[in-house]
């Protein structure tokens, strides 16, 4: 019998070894009460996986995205 959860984060565990070249596209989810949720669609198996926001290339991607967003 499933236990009801008081919250629902779509990402529970995160991949910390995902190559940028294997990512088809990225989604950044803003889910209340959840850690930063970044979802990648992988090229090699078409899976949607949650990836670690601490990955170096993800940090760079987020930095660029934010700069682009707030550029005057």
């Amino acid at each position: 019998k499933p236990v009801s959860l008081s919250y629902r984060c779509p990402c529970r565990f995160f991949e910390s070894h995902v190559a940028r070249a294997n990512v088809k596209h990225l989604k950044i989810l803003n889910t209340p009460n959840c850690a930063l949720q970044i979802v990648a669609r992988l090229k090699n198996n078409n899976r949607q996986v949650c990836i670690d926001p601490k990955l170096k290339w993800i940090q760079e991607y987020l930095e660029k995205a934010l700069n682009k967003r707030f550029k005057m």
Epitope: P2, P10, C11, R12, F13, F14, E15, V39, R47, Q48, V49, C50, I51
Partner: nanobody, 124 residues
């Protein structure tokens, strides 16, 4: 009846060890990723550790890395969480859950089978 049953919880002193078990009945765990979660009083439920079905890849929360080890015995349809160097902060109800997609990092995972939990208390 399909269910997950946790066991192995209890009261342990700081620095001590416990081994939790998650046994499946009514289905086999072979094709499922199995995650351990915990919930302390007044806190949100958090993912502690997880093991994939196919490749056996393991995942750990930063707070338990180097102290906890997850393993699976498909022949016994059981997953274990070995917890060493326990701290008072580890006190919580520990739950196991099964993910049919077979991998822990799946988007929208762990919506299906959950156990009822086992209490772990770390106190002197």
């Amino acid at each position: 009846e399909v269910q997950l049953v946790e066991s192995g919880g209890g009261l342990v002193q700081p620095g001590g060890s416990l081994r939790l078990s998650c046994a499946a009945s009514g289905f086999t765990l072979d094709d499922y990723a199995i995650g351990w979660f915990r919930q302390a009083p007044g806190k949100e439920r958090e993912g502690v550790s997880c093991i994939n079905s196919n490749d056996g890849n393991t995942y750990y929360a930063d707070s338990v890395k180097g102290r906890f080890t997850i393993s699976r015995d498909n022949a016994k349809s059981t997953v274990y969480l070995q917890m060493n160097s326990l701290k008072p902060d580890d006190t919580a109800v520990y739950y196991c859950a099964a993910e049919a997609m077979g991998y822990c990092s799946a988007y929208g995972s762990f919506e299906g089978y959950w156990g009822q939990g086992t209490q772990v208390t770390v106190s002197s």
